[in-house]
């Protein structure tokens, strides 16, 4: 029947497993008169045959490793042997079976690694080849460390990238390897095909000898640098050294200071470039970086600590031009009048900022000098000799010397003698009655005016009135502001009123003076007043416990994982239903009752992080009021993007014939997060069969060079498969194809005769 095994002459592709004895025909082509017979040409290798009636078959087992694709042509001939149809391309793709074992390129490898090398950074590659198809498990190699000798405390110091054969240190190896304790290690490495997943896989082993060398790339001890140095700058303060010559050193200022006073030279010596000022900045933390010639970091940055040592370069300063204190007429000896607090910008708790206070002058000296004393270290002024009389001297001026160990400063204090505080404040009303307010009354509203009077000397601390709410407002929803001229008190709302928690509040005010009352006088009921605040209910929307809820999860969490939760309460005590709004990617769902948020689809940091959605809390019943909060899901990166080519490389060509081996540079990238050091890709050819013609060499972490090994290339397109491994955790590998055309050139451009215009390369090498 026409269809799978028979039909007209047209381009076709067939896939046949290698190694199988022929068991059925490939295809029966049907002739259309005047065609009577068929002819087969191309890469038949005397295996593929077409009978005159169009029966295409093969006569012995195929071998993919000899030829992976047979490009055949079938033509229909008339009775004169003239082609009347075709020839059409017939492609036989030979499917791979696992009939080749992997083989290490060397039976023994040797390498060296520095102690404290970055974990995961390859220092040696073992390489095995398998002639089977790398695009199938048959040719997918899986490297493993069979044994590490010596093995200390059962801890593996080395790890191997099971796809690329890159050997690197584990975290423990990075921390614990020490050439003084153990200068050499031996690894036995195995390689299996079938991606290591099948019991039918073939394998090979090799031995790796590793020498551990000392790492001199270490952070120096913290440096202390005296401020305001008068020595000529720059001054060398410390140094770093990379393990090998030729590194390029630089400093990184993580704090982005407007003035960064450090530099590093190409020997790794670190300098301070200008005098430092401890009072501007008392410590610096920055990083020294060593890079290769291509600007890629060779290792992790080293943290450099510089502490700026204080010198006494700041005099004491007074708190204000004149500091004013009050003292009552009848105050007792020793009473505190007030404390003068001077400042010193030098380092706290050192001799440079330790202050002494001394009264150097009192005016007037009536009735005598030395009426006041000051505590030498605390700066507290006290009455020293006798009580004062306002009618004799209403005001005293003191000059106080404040000194540190090198500097002296004069500060001025004015002491006003005021009446004795023998009158208490008296409220004009003891009960301000009831006040009814809705619970949504605005914050800042004045809801009540209260008034007390005090018969003491006006505009002194004895007559000034401070109002306090002493009862009925434990939440601090209310406050009282005092007008200093009239002593009027304005009761204001400081926090939202709440019917649900305090429908009725019995508020008690107390009026008092900032100055103490004289001995024997006490505040009594006259200094107290009350009022009743009645709050009426307003149906309010639920309230979230936070404006923004934030959670952090790894982007590869399993579907159904709880990633966060939100909470809201309804002021009226109604139940709440939670929902999500703006989940544009369909990643999340929320439990309507509990507010727990779960993933419902694979998350992807590369699509955007944080992922922001709104959560809505709605009353169940009632007015169905709702409120909205934000939920921000921060996605932590996992290595889930294989490397790929950074751009489109179609159109690469070499002029044919090659006069000398040529090369071209290509760049790789991937979409995962690369923090300080950027990507660190490794490159290798995608299949063993390419190694006779091509080689790939790494330039840096993102770029590699593809070079021809000889000049004997046919005039056609070659597709070069390249493996790019990102060395991540887990390591991911991409196989990319670079199409390279060898073509006749006219004036440096690829020449194609008319009628062959498809895919003309545009970039010459």
């Amino acid at each position: 029947q026409e269809g799978k095994f028979s039909g007209p002459l047209k381009p076709m592709t067939f896939s046949i497993y290698e190694g199988q004895e022929p068991s059925q025909i490939i295809f029966q082509f049907k002739a259309n008169p005047p065609a009577v017979t068929f002819e087969l040409t191309g890469e038949t290798d005397n295996i593929f045959v077409i009978e005159r009636e169009g029966l295409l078959y093969y006569n012995r087992a195929l071998d993919r490793e000899t030829r992976s694709t047979h490009n055949l042509q079938v033509a229909a001939l008339d009775a004169n042997g003239i082609i009347v149809e075709g020839p059409v391309p017939i492609t036989i793709k030979v499917k791979d079976i696992n009939d080749n074992r992997p083989t290490f390129l060397q039976s023994k490898y040797e390498g060296s690694v520095r102690q404290n090398s970055r974990p995961g950074k390859p220092f040696l590659y073992v390489n095995a080849t398998d002639l089977d198809d790398p695009a199938t498990p048959n040719g997918q190699l899986y490297y493993q460390i069979v044994i590490q000798l010596p093995m200390i405390n059962n801890v593996m110091y080395f790890q191997i990238n099971n796809k690329t054969g890159a050997i690197s240190l584990t975290r423990e190896g990075s921390q614990e390897l020490n050439p003084a304790k153990n200068p050499s290690y031996n690894l036995v490495i195995s390689v299996k095909d079938m991606g290591g997943q099948s019991e039918n896989s073939f394998s090979d082993t090799t031995s790796v000898d590793i020498i551990v060398t000392e790492n001199i790339w270490k952070a120096p001890k913290p440096v202390e640098m005296v401020e305001n140095s008068t020595d000529p700058h720059p001054i060398k303060i410390t140094q770093v050294r990379w393990n090998d010559p030729g590194a390029q050193y630089s400093l990184v200022d993580k704090e982005k200071l407007p003035r960064f006073p450090f530099s590093i030279d190409q020997e790794g010596d670190i300098y301070v470039t200008q005098p430092l000022d401890r009072e501007e900045k008392d410590a610096y933390v920055f990083y020294a970086v060593a890079k290769d010639e291509y600007g890629k970091p060779l290792s992790y940055p080293l943290e450099i600590h510089v502490k700026v040592k204080d010198i006494n370069d700041n005099p004491p300063t007074c708190p204000s031009p004149v500091t004013v204190f009050e003292v009552q007429e009848n105050e007792r000896l020793g009473n505190s009048i007030g404390t003068l607090t001077a400042h010193d910008r030098d380092e706290e708790n050192t001799a440079n900022s330790f202050l002494n206070y001394r009264i150097v002058e009192q005016t007037p000296k009536l009735p005598m000098d030395g009426l006041f004393l000051i505590q030498t270290y605390a700066g507290m002024l006290q009455l020293a000799k006798q009580s004062l009389k306002k009618q004799d001297t209403p005001q005293y001026n003191l000059t106080i010397e404040v000194s540190d160990k090198d500097f002296k400063t004069l500060c001025f204090v004015q002491i006003n003698v005021i009446d004795i505080n023998d009158q208490i404040p008296i409220f004009e009303k003891s009960d301000y009655g009831n006040l009814t307010l809705a619970e949504d009354t605005n914050i800042g509203s004045t809801i009540l005016t209260i008034q007390a009077t005090d018969a003491d000397e006006p505009f002194t601390g004895s007559s000034k009135i401070l109002y306090h709410i002493i009862k009925g407002d434990s939440e601090g929803r209310l406050g009282v502001d005092t007008d200093p001229h009239t002593n009027t008190g304005y009761v204001i709302i400081k926090k939202p009123l709440d019917f649900e928690t305090a429908a009725v509040s019995n508020i008690v005010f107390k009026a008092e003076n900032p100055e103490p009352l004289v001995f024997g006088v006490k505040y009594n009921a006259s200094s107290f007043a009350k009022f009743t605040l009645i709050v009426t209910d307003v149906n309010e929307a639920p309230q979230f416990s936070q404006h923004v809820f934030q959670a952090k999860v790894s982007e590869d969490v399993a579907i159904g994982t709880k990633v966060g939760n939100v909470t809201a309460k309804d002021p009226e005590g109604l139940d709440i239903s939670y929902s999500l709004r703006g989940d544009t990617r369909g990643w999340l769902k929320i439990d309507h009752v509990t507010g727990e948020i779960f993933s419902v689809a694979p998350l992807d940091r590369e699509a955007g992080s944080p992922y922001r959605v709104q959560v809505v809390a709605t009353e169940v019943g009632g007015s169905s009021l709702s409120s909205v909060s934000e939920f921000h899901l921060i996605l932590m990166d996992v290595n889930d993007n294989p490397p790929r080519l950074a751009k489109d490389y179609t159109g690469l060509f070499f002029c044919h014939p090659l006069s000398a081996p040529g090369s071209l540079i290509f760049e790789a990238t991937d979409d995962d997060q690369h923090l300080f050091r950027g990507p660190h890709f490794t490159f290798s050819l995608g299949s063993g069969s390419l190694q006779n013609d091509w080689e790939v060499s790494k330039i840096n972490g993102t770029h590699a060079r593809l070079s021809t090994r000889h000049t004997e290339f046919e005039e056609r397109e070659y597709v070069v498969l390249i493996r790019i491994n990102d060395g991540g955790r887990p390591p991911l590998e991409g196989i990319v194809s670079l199409p390279v055309t060898f073509c006749s050139c006219v004036e440096g451009s690829c020449f194609r005769p008319a009628g062959h215009q498809t895919g003309i390369p545009t970039v010459g090498m």
Partner: antibody, heavy 123, light 107 residues
Framework: QVQLVQSGAEVKKPGSSVKVSCKVS????????IHWMKQRPGQGLEWIGY????????QYNEKFKGKVTLTADKSTSTAYMELSSLRSEDTAVYLC????????????????WGQGTTVTVSS | DIQMTQSQSSLSASVGDRVGITCKAS??????VAWYQQKPGKAPKLLIY???NRYTGVPSRFSGSGSGTDFTLTISSLQPKDFATYFC?????????FGQGTKLEIK
Amino acid sequence: QVQLVQSGAEVKKPGSSVKVSCKVSGYTFTDHTIHWMKQRPGQGLEWIGYIYPRDVITQYNEKFKGKVTLTADKSTSTAYMELSSLRSEDTAVYLCARWGYFYGSRSYYFDYWGQGTTVTVSS
Amino acid sequence: DIQMTQSQSSLSASVGDRVGITCKASQNVGTAVAWYQQKPGKAPKLLIYSASNRYTGVPSRFSGSGSGTDFTLTISSLQPKDFATYFCQQYSSYPWTFGQGTKLEIK
């Protein structure tokens, strides 16, 4: 040995028909195509068409379509060419020839020819 | 149709001469060209096929060359029996066509 023997000369009136035969021997008749050529005195050869006796496939030069019909009789290993509606310009020697190609060969040529048949159209 | 042009309708030469008979195709025919010799009252005889292959039994003094559109039949040393008419023929595409013939005469 291979031989192609054509029928004898014919004199025909305009508007009539003539059937010329070409009897082959010395090979399997169905393996090769038989071609017919026209040659007028002092002129070159013109290819009329061919017949493939095995599958009775024919192909004609567009110029002779409607004028010529090619047939074959496998039982007698004879190929025929019939000319219809004869006119004076049909006067010529008509030759049959074997095309040397057979499946799998590279023999692209007329290797054996008949002796020719003269057809004269005259009133 | 493809025209096969033999520009010399006749050619005079002597015994022992080397002669070349040319044939030009109106479009590319690759190497799908044969040469035939015909004597008066006789059927043509095959000399050369695929532009340059000598047919079995044909003397070696006959050779063919060319491809694409220009073809030549060369007789390296003329013999008395070589005086005849020579035709080229293309079988690259239907309808097949012959040249008008070149008559080789004794000088």
